[in-house]
């Protein structure tokens, strides 16, 4: 496949001409609600805008230069003037607010804990067999192994202070070493960038919203993994990481300290542990090859456990088997040793939701796995309903103006820095990269955060979650000290690196030009967006650790050809882009290939067939399920809720000549009525100031 | 009380065997090892062997394979030493002993029965 | 084997006085001594276990101290019942094996 989809003719300016880049529509001046109708990202420029079949009127436009895609939308107040209200009006509309804000925290709370649950659920589903990579002996000399390991573990646990806690705790049992530990850190940290795409997803029901949720939540991900395509190499050759970090840990005298501030985590788990609890430490066990832990359940039962320490008598083959040569006899017939016996006593049951069901870990794993996502998509469609009825006019221009705006010249540069300064210190205070971004990705999707300035809050949040381990290993007792503040300090120096490589040159912020290409793919092609999740976090990690379970020959065999492949198509494209002469005529562009291979439409076709039955009669019960519907069928009127796409065909007819831009009808009420957003009487009762 | 009657004296001659009994009361005979010791002036108490009532179970000293056979009966809870090929050497007090749990200790031991090897 | 040496095979007491009957092993056996006692003409009779324990019903002025392989018997305020062969032994491992003992006499 072209590096590019759908790449006629190599142009210089490739933004332009990305699938979905060209064609957007003039922004709406009620941006925050737009729908598929108002945004076709396939039409040219020069082609003519008719109004829906709905319209009585047709009107007619000159061809206009089409908007920037990424220009953040307009939040048009739509609402009565604070000015123009009487005092009881006034009274309703302060209550409205604060009833606003309320739903927001409250929206906000389930939205982390079903975060939370989607980690254990996760972790149900898939711990025991994330605990079996680990013991996978190959890991020491293979770092491409360790690394797609860390990926792999982490997508499944969903959880990478979950993963890292196992590598330390093989660490100071000397089952892994250091060098072998740094690859599976790095793939930890690709993992976890999981978590926000799948939040992204969530926003797939309105096509420039997706383009922007889906960029603002993948340049975490294209940030992680060229990071790790620079510096395993590098790291493999030189051994920078481990180096660097063992003189800080020799260097300095460390005493335990605390524990990091369990911030967020004191709000979230009185809920969280009322719906499931689990012992964690069976993931770690697995890993470190113990064998009564693979029957084991993840599910907590007994919260409240007595430990008492007996020694018994037990007999050994020989007293060669002495447990100490002190501790050693016979009876005459047997020999006899005394050992440790750790006697648990169970007091307590936990007062979780699966505590007496025994269910099997898979069963309350897909269980947890669906409420969870429906729960996580509901918070966050009606997160981003409460922001986007707030976050409008005034207040939409204030926040806005304080999040995007750079310091004056010539401190300009410093803005992005404080920005990744932001993005740590929030991480540190939420305990977790996930939330943070996950929390980002909705913003972005409605236009309060441009990418630009998500991409150094993310950077930032990668920096947090390193803290946070660097504290935790400073609290870990003695025994493991060492090798945990090691790993931590070398997540935090990898992520260090990964920044001083792709952010300080604007020329080099490589993940947003990425992340905005797969945004802009994503948008016209949304099966794409849950392909490209499937691939990158799933295919690929599970294709190289079967090559390497293979042995070095066989990785390397179809390793070679492949990373061969991928220079050539990268080098292609660059002089296609920047010199295309030099090329013969032949390959100057990309259509000497069959279509299937540079472009995603054949691709697409086939997608449509499988969801054939899903675009036929795309009904949906609410908007929770819209989504899923919208991902599978493509329809431009999924997302309206409880409708049918009874006229599909006449949608698809019409699908390359653009809908008229709702700022041409006179009342912005009745365009937003007619774009099925709100009833024509909502706009009266509409109260944007807080 | 825990109490072990061991057999008589013997007197045999050379090259012929003996088996000497000692009948156990006052415990689980099942549950403890028992033990044989001999006693000769000249080599003090040496450890014979040792049988498990249990299963039957045994264990010897290596000095004394192929001399000492333990048995025994539970149903009338007594042991059994057979002594073979005896010899002027084998003349001695032999002592059954009631092992300690799980212990190579002898906690009660029997009366003694005084073996004479003369032609 | 493992052997039990008891250096003196007589040892000469008043009533009243304390004595220490020694007992070196020939490797380490850690805490697996017994003694015993043997009267004249009687069976012998377990006194001590795990090197320091008592058995049950006997008096507590027999103490036994020692590990890995020097041990000692202490009878303090010595009487005249007390009077008659002592050995110790060790289960570390088969076979078991004994002190060749030492015969406690009066002055």
């Known amino acids: 496949m072209a590096p590019w989809p759908e790449l006629g003719d190599a142009q210089p300016n490739p933004d332009k001409y990305l699938e979905g880049a060209a064609g957007q529509q003039p922004t709406a001046p009620d941006k925050s609600k737009e729908t598929n109708k108002t945004d076709n990202t396939e039409a040219p420029v020069t082609k003519i805008e008719l109004l829906p079949s709905y319209s009585t009127a047709t009107l007619i436009d000159e061809p206009t230069e089409v908007d920037d895609p990424w220009n953040l939308p307009t939040l048009q107040d739509s609402g009565i003037k604070w000015s123009e209200r009487d005092t009881k009006g006034k009274i309703l509309c302060f209550f409205q607010g604060i009833g606003r804000l309320i739903l927001l925290l409250g929206f906000l709370y389930f939205f982390v804990c079903s975060l939370d649950i989607l980690s254990s659920a996760f972790q149900l589903v898939g711990g025991k067999m994330a605990g079996q990579f680990f013991s996978n002996s190959s890991i020491m000399s293979n770092p491409l192994l360790g690394l797609v390991i860390g990926v792999l573990v982490t997508v499944l646990v969903q959880s990478s202070s979950t993963s890292t806690s196992i590598v330390v705790s093989m660490v100071s049992s000397s089952l892994l070493t250091v060098r072998a530990a740094i690859p599976i850190i790095m793939g930890a940290n690709i993992g976890t960038s999981i978590t926000n795409t799948i939040v992204a997803l969530m926003q797939v029901g309105d096509r420039s919203e997706f383009r922007r949720a889906f960029a603002g939540a993948t340049v975490h991900d294209f940030f992680n993994w060229l990071s790790v395509l620079v510096l395993l190499p590098v790291e493999v050759a030189t051994h920078y990481l481990e180096i660097i970090t063992q003189l800080i840990v020799e260097s300095f005298h460390f005493k335990n300290g605390e524990d990091a501030p369990d911030l967020l985590k004191v709000i979230t788990k009185p809920f969280t542990k009322l719906i499931v609890q689990l012992d964690k430490k069976v993931i770690s066990q697995i890993a470190m090859n113990d064998e009564k832990a693979k029957n084991k359940s993840l599910v907590k039962i007994w919260c409240k456990t007595f430990t008492n320490k007996t020694q018994i008598n037990v007999t050994v083959p020989s007293t060669a088997n002495c447990t100490s040569p002190s501790l050693c006899w016979t009876d005459g017939i047997q020999n006899w040793t005394m050992k440790n016996v750790t006697y648990k006593e169970n007091i307590a049951k936990c007062q979780h939701i699966f505590v007496n069901f025994h269910l099997p870990d898979l069963a309350v794993g897909t269980i947890l796995l669906i409420l969870s996502l429906l729960v996580l998509c509901g918070c966050l469609i009606m997160i981003v309903k409460i922001l986007g009825s707030v976050l409008k006019g005034q207040v939409a221009t204030v926040i806005k103006k304080t999040i995007n705006t750079d310091f004056p010249f010539p401190f300009a540069w410093l803005t992005g820095y404080l920005a990744i300064l932001v993005g740590a210190g929030m991480t540190f205070i939420v305990q977790s990269s996930s939330v943070f971004t996950s929390a980002l990705t909705p913003l972005i999707g409605i236009g309060v955060i441009t990418i630009e300035r998500a991409y150094p809050l993310t950077l930032g949040s990668n920096i947090g979650t390193t803290t946070t381990a660097i504290l935790a290993a400073l609290a870990s007792p003695g025994n493991a000290l060492r090798s945990s503040l090691q790993i931590a300090l070398c997540h935090f120096f990898f992520n260090i690196s990964g920044i001083l490589l792709w952010y300080p040159i604007p020329f080099t912020r490589l993940p947003i030009r990425m992340a905005k290409g797969l945004g802009n793919i994503s948008a016209k092609y949304r099966w794409f967006a849950v392909f490209y999740l499937i691939i990158f976090f799933f295919l690929i990690p599970l294709t190289v650790f079967g090559l390497s379970l293979a042995g070095w020959r066989v990785l390397v065999g179809v390793g070679v050809p492949v990373v061969f492949i991928i220079i050539l198509v990268l080098c292609l494209r660059l002089l296609q882009s920047r010199c295309p002469r030099v090329l013969p005529k032949k390959l100057q562009n990309w259509n000497f290939l069959p279509l299937w291979m540079r472009s995603l439409k054949p691709w697409d076709a086939v997608v449509s067939k499988f969801t054939g039955c899903f675009q036929m009669r795309c009904c949906c019960c609410c908007r929770v399920c819209c989504r899923a519907c919208c991902l599978l069928c493509d329809c431009p009127k999924c997302c309206r809720c409880s409708k049918c796409c009874e006229d599909l065909e006449e949608a698809q007819e019409g699908q390359d000549v653009p809908v008229k831009a709702p700022e041409t009808f006179d009342n912005i009420t009745i365009s937003r009525e007619a774009q099925g957003e709100v009833p024509a009487s909502d706009s009266k009762t509409e109260c944007t100031a807080l | 009380q825990v109490q072990l009657q061991q057999s008589g004296a013997e007197l045999v001659r050379p090259g012929a065997s003996v088996k000497m009994s000692c009948k156990a009361s006052?415990?689980?005979?099942?549950?403890?090892?028992m033990h044989w010791v001999k006693k000769t002036p000249r080599q003090g108490l040496e450890w014979i062997g040792a049988i498990y009532p249990g299963n039957g179970n045994t264990s010897y000293n290596q000095k004394f394979k192929g001399k000492a056979t333990l048995t025994v009966d539970k149903s009338s809870s007594t042991a059994y030493m057979q002594l073979s090929s005896l010899t002027s050497e084998d003349s001695a007090v032999y002592f059954c002993?009631?092992?300690?749990?799980?212990?190579?200790?002898?906690?009660?031991w029997g009366q003694g029965t005084s073996v004479t090897v003369s032609s | 084997d493992i052997v039990m040496t008891q250096s003196h095979k007589f040892m000469s007491t008043s009533v009243g006085d304390r004595v220490s009957i020694t007992c070196k092993a020939s490797?380490?056996?850690?805490?697996?001594v017994a003694w015993y006692q043997q009267k004249p003409g009687q069976s012998p009779k377990l006194l001590i276990y795990?090197?320091?324990t008592r058995h049950t019903g006997v008096p507590d002025r027999f103490t036994g101290s020692g590990s890995g392989t020097d041990f000692t018997l202490t009878i303090s305020n010595v009487q005249s019942e007390d009077l008659a062969d002592y050995f110790c032994?060790?289960?570390?491992?088969?076979?078991?094996?004994f002190g060749a003992g030492t015969k406690l006499e009066l002055k």
């Open positions: 490797q380490d056996v850690g805490s697996s």
């Open positions: 795990w090197a320091s």
């Open positions: 002993v009631r092992g300690g749990r799980g212990l190579g200790t002898m906690d009660y």
């Open positions: 032994q060790h289960y570390r491992n088969i076979p078991l094996t």
């Open positions: 006052g415990y689980t005979f099942a549950s403890y090892n």
